[in-house]
Every structure is written in structure tokens, then in C-alpha cells.
Amino acid sequence: GELETSDLVTVVLGQDAKLPCFYRGDPDEQVGQVAWARVDPNEGTRELALLHSKYGLHVSPAYEDRVEQPPPPRDPLDGSILLRNAVQADEGEYECRVSTFPAGSFQARMRLRVLVPPLPSLNPGPPLEEGQGLTLAASCTAEGSPAPSVTWDTEVKGTQSSRSFKHSRSAAVTSEFHLVPSRSMNGQPLTCVVSHPGLLQDQRITHTLQVAFLAEASVRGLEDQNLWHVGREGATLKCLSEGQPPPKYNWTRLDGPLPSGVRVKGDTLGFPPLTTEHSGVYVCHVSNELSSRASQVTVEVLADPEDPGKQVDLVSAS
């Protein structure tokens, strides 16, 4: 007869490991007992369980409530056991010793490998600002057994570098993603992808890039100067900029306070019916935590050509 077993049994942390040991013998042969032991290079052989043909399974104190026979139907020649809820410390070499009648004793060894799936974590780097050189955007760390693979999935141009730290029963892998920040990256996804034999599918953690910037300011509303005449209603100036974080806007008049009735509403300066007093230099101030910008325009309110009191007699003038 001979023992049918497996050189390597692989199980994911927390799952049940079936340690196989089946005696393939002649029809008249019987298995008396199967002794299971843990073989440790430092501690030697430690008994794990004894499976007796007549009296069932008796388990070592260290494995109480953790070792069972596989569920029925059971073959009397099958000495396999189930190791419940495998933990990392269970990884190692196991031995089954089968006592048969009349053929004698047989033994076989197998290695139990416990896969520890990683629980990845993503840590954003320091705040990104346009104008910086090569900067850490994010780092991603995953620890498992065996060592996981950590890569990045993104449309953003950058460089990635990895390093790993070996522990007694696992390895931690950290991958960093560096880039030169630009405003076009703002809102772009940066995804850490972790692969491991203990995972059914890759684990993905996405970080949305935030690049601080502040665009130059400009003012819209003076495209047609002829519209800025006395009496016109609803005249506005709008300050144009963009930034991350979103900027705050403020309006001032260079040559004095804002005329009465002129209202500031965010990026927009609203005028009451225009008078010549509204002429002047207006400054739009844009700022966020990163920077501040300004843009100024000169408003010249023209006299209303239809106002007879202000009409010029061209004939007499000539």
C-alpha cells in the first residue's frame, strides 16, 4: 500500500485547511490509527491529533476545538483531518503516520501554506501645488503573505517606486507615486492596485488628485465700450479666474471707494443705472490659500447721446 497525500496545501487565512492522508492498500488491509504531528525545525515534532479507527479523533490541547474529521461519508482508510480557521502560525510542515494491519506503518509529510490577504491603505502625500517639482502624490502600503504586488493605475503622468520590508511571517510592500503637479491633474483619479494569490480579485483604492493653483484674473463686461453710457441699467463686470481651492473674489475702486449703489456679488460687480460718477479704475482681487491675483479695468461712462440737456450743438460749435 501507499499514502496518498499532497506536498503542499494552500489555504487562505481564516479558512479551513484539509490535510489529506489516504491509505491506498489492498482490500484486506485495515488502518488502525493515524497520528498527526506538526514538524518544527526548532521545536521538533509535536503531536497534533490521533485518529483511531475505533475510537475516533483525540486532539492535542493546543488544537482543542480546531481539529476535526472531514464531514461524512468517511472512508475507513482516510486519515485526513480538517484544521479549522487557519492562522498564520499554522503555516509549516505536518506529518501523518498511518499504522496499518498487516502492512505496518507509513508516513508522509506535507507543507501548509497560509495565504494572508493584504489590507491595503493609501496615504496621500503633502498638498500638491502647481509649480512644484517632482512631488509625492500618494503612497500605498499592503502587508500579506506572500508579499503582495502593489501597482498604480492612472492617466496621470508620473513615476512609481516600490520597497518591501520582510517580517517573520509576512512582507509589507509600499509603493510611492511621484508627479510634477499641474492644474490639468486636478480631479484625476490615482488608483492603487493590490494583487495577491489570497484575493479573488485585485483590490483597488482610488485617490482623487487635488492640485492647488490659481489662474490669472481677467475682467469681462467691457468688450463693447459703447454700452457703458449714462442711464444704462444692468451693467456688470465679471471677474474671471479659476483655482483649487476655489478662489474668493473682492472688488475695489482704485481711485476711491466703490460708488453708492454698486453691489459686489461674488465675482460680479453690479451697477445701478450708470452715471458719469461710475467712471473709474476697478480692481478685481482673486485669492485662495495658495496665492492671490488682481486685474484692473478702466470704466468710462459716456454721456447719453439722447439726453438733450447734454447734447452738443454741432452747428454752433463749428
Partner: antibody, heavy 122, light 111 residues
Framework: QVQLVQSGAEVKKPGASVKVSCKAS????????IHWVRQAPGQGLEWMGI????????SSAQKFQGRVTMTRDTSTSTVYMELSSLRSEDTAVYYC???????????????WGQGTLVTVSS | QSVLTQPPSVSEAPRQRVTISCSGS????????VNWYQQLPGKAPKLLIY???LLPSGVSDRFSGSKSGTSASLAISGLQSEDEADYYC???????????FGGGTKLTVLG
Amino acid sequence: QVQLVQSGAEVKKPGASVKVSCKASGYTFTSYYIHWVRQAPGQGLEWMGIINPISGRTSSAQKFQGRVTMTRDTSTSTVYMELSSLRSEDTAVYYCAKEGVGGELLRAFDIWGQGTLVTVSS
Amino acid sequence: QSVLTQPPSVSEAPRQRVTISCSGSSSNIGNNAVNWYQQLPGKAPKLLIYYDDLLPSGVSDRFSGSKSGTSASLAISGLQSEDEADYYCAAWDDSLNGFVFGGGTKLTVLG
């Protein structure tokens, strides 16, 4: 060699408690269960309970439940059995015994302590 | 009153063969292994037979064990004076969830 060495004889008054120790040597202490068995003068053997030396989990005979406490100290490979509310009929030799035979995990006691005589008398 | 029943005493002449019986039920002997212990006067018990019929190393093969149904027996052949002792059978009891012992049998070697 494998052995269990117990503490010395004790004399106790009724109602008191006694704590008997059993120090293991010559084998991996946490690998085998330890049982406690007692024998009253001129009487047979009586099983009291079992302790898992690695987890400290215990199970005792119904007769002793609530009165017997089994503990262990893995740092010294020692098991303790404390019996409370002693009465005269608890006068007996108390034995600790290692489960297993020649390293195999069998439900039999291959190594016994030398015994500790506990006398309960007023 | 012990869960397992043994005769209180047996006696036989030297060089003869003696048998000690042990009777139980399906929850102990019927379903579990039987062990036999020898206790010499003033000494701790010693394992003699385990798992019905197996001898620990160092035990003389003059001792043998057997089991049938809910009964077990210990046989000692070629009796010697040093075999004079108390003999106990024991088994795990599934109902009581603990070990049970027989009341013990005192063996006297005559002559």
C-alpha cells in the same frame, strides 16, 4: 525523564480550602492534558477533572462542580487543583496524571504524580 | 457505587492465569477505549493496558487486555508474587463527560 511532582501532605479543617500543586518536567507541558484523580483511604480511584494546559480550559466531574478549581502556570509548567468547602469525606490522596501514552495522544494516563495526602479533620 | 463494575477480589496460585472482568455500558466501555491500571500498595497507579489491548513499553507481555461489547477483561498469566496489587479498569464516559473507574479488584497470589 517525564515526571509529575506534587506538593506535600496537608491537614485542613472542615470548611477550609486546599490547593495542591503538580509540577511537570521532561516533556512539552502544553502538549498534553492533565487530569486530577483522588483516592479515599481503602477506596477506589475517582476522577475529578481535566485541564488544558495551554488554554487553561477545565472540565470537572459533576460531583465536584462549584468546589474544584483547576489552574495552570505555563511559565513554571505547574498545574494546581484547589478544593473548597472541605469536609471529612474529602480526606484522600490526590493525584495529578498526564494524558497520553509514550507521546501519543491517547485517552489514558501514562504518568502519575506521587500523590498528595489531604486530611480533613476538626 | 462505581460506574464500572469489577469483582472486589480474585486470587490464584503462582504461575497460573487469572482474569479480572470489568462491566460497563454503551456510554463508556461500549463506545470508548478501556485502560487498565495496576496499583501496588502505597504507590501511585501505573498504566498497564491502554486502548483495550495495547501494552505500554516496559510492561510485561504476561498482561493482556480484551474487550467485547460493554465488557472488558484483564488477563495475567504466569502469576508472580509481585503481581499482588489492586487493578482498576477505566474508560471515558460520553454521558458523564469524564473518566469513570471500576471499584478496583484486589489480586492475591496464593502460597
